[in-house]
């Protein structure tokens, strides 16, 4: 055992920065720090076989399997995967350890399996075994958290039935509005399932696992706040738990709170009250209305009344299935090159949506903001004034929604020209779509003013590059113009742009494309 080399096996996970990852040493990847794989001599094996802990990675992940060998002298090596030999080039690190790496780019099923590394050193021969499999993420789920009352205690339990088991945290804030944004100093996070301090202004519970993060806000009516102009609305699906908190502050304890559904007092067992004195000796009362599993008949106006405050209501709507309500008609926008502009979609949805903005096959993160009227809005401003088609896609457990936007950027045409033996073509991407003219340059018309109308064929939009329209014009070659310079011009309301082409002559002149503008 003392004569054997010290072997360290590591896994390096790469975050792909680019879809065109190659196997060269300069592939555009950001690497996480190496992770030890606990390489150990395999018990009762013939020969010296080291084994690394089994590795499970996501499909399309890019990883490096690496072995560091602390043994004197040179080493030679060979990788074997599914009976195929793979090249192996050891190098030495700063600590003079031999380093052997196997890069697996964009992991697929065919790349899963056993990777054997055979190493020959001056002292001994040994084998290192890596087993790489693809993680089955099909079983993964992340469900929105919901609340339950803790048995025999005035506390709420936050539950998220997710796989892998999520980390649950309460996100608490005692300020109003904007200052309750996630990373604000007013926000306090508690990584626990049970919450006893239920008097705060804003209470949310979030669950996170490998799939992301989902949050649920404790719906609250604050009798000390001016009511919203539109009645607050709460949607729930049949079978989900209902929780509404009514909160009121008064100079002394001489007030009470009650809940009514459609003017009928809630049954006992469907509410509980808590009270506390605040720092300035005012009394805070909260009264929870809850139904452990809602049915259609739990729909209606829930009103919280106080003997010392004006009452306030919320409309609870119980639905069989989730929904996304928004207008899906496509929208076209035309803006100047430096004009500030954002796409926006206003929608009403339950459960909360997951969404993306897509442009030219690239997805962008999607942020949503709740409005006071029960609607939400998602804006996208990061278009960098690139014309084309933008797609907003939203989905929740029960519904999907897609909306298309076209962005046109007003600009003067820019012309590209190409010619063949039989025709000359010009292309332009200006907007509004340009009109075309062709002119012949000759002794009679050195300024190229002689217009060509014969043999011209205009196509308004002959190809779409990620939704961007390109206009083209083609001039068919005739004997009358062979050997001459011709000029194609594209013009729109913002200006004109031209390109000059020397048409292929039958004489000794070779074909040239001349870009004189």
């Amino acid at each position: 055992n003392q004569d054997l080399p010290v072997i360290k096996c590591v896994l390096i996970n790469h975050k792909n920065n680019d879809s065109s990852v190659g196997k060269s040493s300069s592939y555009p990847m950001v690497s996480e720090s190496p992770e030890d794989l606990g390489c150990a001599l395999r018990p009762q094996s013939s020969g010296t076989v080291y084994e690394a802990a089994a590795v499970e990675v996501d499909v399309s992940a890019s990883i490096t399997l690496q072995v560091l060998v602390d043994a004197p002298g040179n080493i030679s090596c060979l990788w074997v995967f599914k009976h195929s030999s793979l090249n192996c080039q050891p190098h030495f690190d700063l600590q003079n350890r031999g380093v052997v790496s196997m890069v697996i780019l964009k992991m697929t099923e065919t790349q899963a399996g056993e990777y054997l590394l055979f190493i020959q050193s001056e002292a001994t021969n040994y084998t290192i075994l890596f087993t790489v499999s693809i993680r089955n993420t099909l079983l993964y789920t992340l469900r929105r958290p919901y609340f339950r009352k803790m048995e025999n205690q005035d506390a709420l339990v936050c539950i998220s039935e997710s796989v892998p088991e999520p980390i649950v945290e309460w996100v608490l804030c005692d300020s109003q509005g904007e200052s309750c944004k996630e990373e604000s100093p007013a926000v306090v996070k508690k990584e626990e399932k049970v919450l006893h301090e239920l008097f705060g202004t804003d209470i949310r519970c979030c669950a996170r696992n490998e799939l992301g993060r989902e949050c649920t806000r404790l719906f609250t009516i604050d009798l000390n706040q001016t009511p919203q102009t539109t009645l607050p609305q709460l949607f729930l699906k049949v079978g989900e738990p209902l929780w509404i908190r009514c909160k009121a502050v008064h100079v002394n304890h001489g007030f009470g709170l009650t809940w009514e559904l459609e003017n009928k007092a809630l049954e006992e067992g469907n509410y509980f009250e808590m009270s506390t004195y605040s720092t300035n000796r005012t009394m805070i009362r909260i009264l929870f209305a809850f139904v452990s599993s809602v049915a259609r008949n739990d729909t209606g106006y829930y009103t919280c009344s106080s003997s010392k405050h004006p009452s306030q209501s919320a409309l609870v709507t119980i639905v069989e299935k989730g929904f996304i309500n928004a207008t899906n008609s496509s929208e076209d926008y035309e803006i100047d090159q430096y004009e500030e502009f954002c796409f926006s979609v206003r929608f009403k949805a339950y459960p909360q949506i997951r969404c993306t903005w897509t442009f030219s096959r690239k997805s962008f993160p999607c942020e949503q903001k709740g409005l006071d009227n029960g609607y939400s809005i998602s804006k996208f401003c990061n278009h960098k004034h690139q014309p084309g088609e933008y797609i907003f896609h939203a989905e929740n457990d029960d519904a999907q929604f897609t909306k298309m936007f076209t962005l046109n950027i007003r600009r003067k045409p820019q012309v590209l020209a190409e010619a063949s033996a039989s025709q000359a073509s010009c292309f332009s991407d200006g907007y509004p779509l340009p009109s075309w003219t062709w002119k012949k340059c000759s002794d009679k018309s050195p300024n190229c003013t002689e217009e060509i109308t014969e043999g011209v064929w205009n196509r308004k939009a002959n190809r779409k590059v990620f939704g961007q329209w390109v206009s083209s014009s083609t001039l068919n070659m005739s004997e009358a113009i062979k050997g001459f310079l011709v000029k194609c011009c594209a013009y729109n309301s913002l200006g004109t742009s031209c390109e000059t082409i020397l048409l292929n002559s039958p004489g000794p002149f070779p074909f040239i494309q001349d870009n004189i503008s």
């Epitope: 896994l11 996970n13 992770e35 030890d36 794989l37 606990g38 150990a40 395999r42 018990p43 009762q44 084994e51 690394a52 802990a53 089994a54 590795v55 499970e56 990675v57 990883i63 056993e114 075994l129 087993t131 499999s133 796989v163 892998p164 088991e165």
Partner: antibody, heavy 124, light 107 residues
Framework: QVTLKESGPTLVKPTETLTLTCTFS??????????VSWIRQPPGKALEWLAH???????SYSTSLKSRLTISKDTSKSQVVLTLTNMDPVDTATYFC????????????????WGQGTMVTVSS | DIQMTQSPSSLSASVGDRVTITCRAS??????LAWYQQKPGKAPKRLIY???SLQSGVPSRFSGSGSGTEFTLTISSLQPEDFATYYC?????????FGGGTKLEIK
């Protein structure tokens, strides 16, 4: 270099809940099939295994303490958390966390690397 | 649960002695057994895994043998740094269980 470090309160009162955190570096529970266990050792006594969490989030607990123990992990923070409810003076011990790699050919080398341990005293 | 009975619970020996510590499992655990050495105020250190595989960096005077229910740890020639407490651990099935320990003292 692989390290594990236990942290938490050094003193807890009877009936309180103990929360211990094992923060590790040099390996992860994200890609490699690894597990982390909690083990304790009362002063002058033998080692006692408490709980284990696997990289796929499966858990296993000591039979005698199962009702009081909860183990969880936060892969992104490289942490494993143990909670032990309703603490009693007999729970006074040094608490260790240790890692256990799993090998695809069906064997395990048990705990190859341990944390230094954290002493917890239960007293009113 | 699988019970691990370790013997002796304490042992006095001299430098150069050959020492054997035994662990008995209450049921078949194949070779899923590890041996650990612990010194006062320190964390345990793995010596042997899979009943007989020597941990990298551990002196070859330590050896392990056995399979099924009977296991032994042998130190062929005791060195001053070997005086410590030794534990066996079965990891064949959960819950995992340690032996009661063997305290090896200088005679």
């Amino acid at each position: 270099q692989v390290t594990l470090k236990e942290s938490g309160p050094t003193l807890v009162k009877p009936t309180e809940t103990l929360t211990l955190t094992c923060t590790f570096s040099g390996f992860s529970l994200r890609y490699a099939r690894m597990g982390v266990s909690w083990i304790r050792q009362p002063p002058g006594k033998a080692l006692e295994w408490l709980a284990h969490i696997f990289s796929n989030d499966e858990k296993s607990y000591s039979t005698s303490l199962k009702s009081r123990l909860t183990i969880s992990k936060d892969t992104s923070k490289s942490q494993v958390v143990l909670t032990l409810t309703n603490m009693d003076p007999v729970d006074t011990a040094t608490y260790f966390c240790a890692r256990m790699p799993e090998y695809s050919s069906g064997w395990s080398g048990a705990f190859d690397i341990w944390g230094q341990g954290t002493m917890v005293t239960v007293s009113s | 649960d699988i019970q691990m009975t370790q013997s002796p619970s304490s042992l006095s020996a001299s430098v150069g002695d050959r020492v054997t510590i035994t662990c008995r499992a209450s049921q078949d655990i194949r070779n899923d057994l590890a041996w650990y050495q612990q010194k006062p105020g320190k964390a345990p250190k793995r010596l042997i895994y899979a009943a007989s595989s020597l941990q990298s960096g551990v002196p070859s005077r330590f050896s392990g043998s056995g399979s099924g229910t009977e296991f032994t740890l042998t130190i062929s020639s005791l060195q001053p740094e070997d005086f410590a407490t030794y534990y066996c651990l079965q990891h064949n099935s959960y819950p995992l269980t340690f032996g009661g320990g063997t305290k090896l003292e200088i005679k």
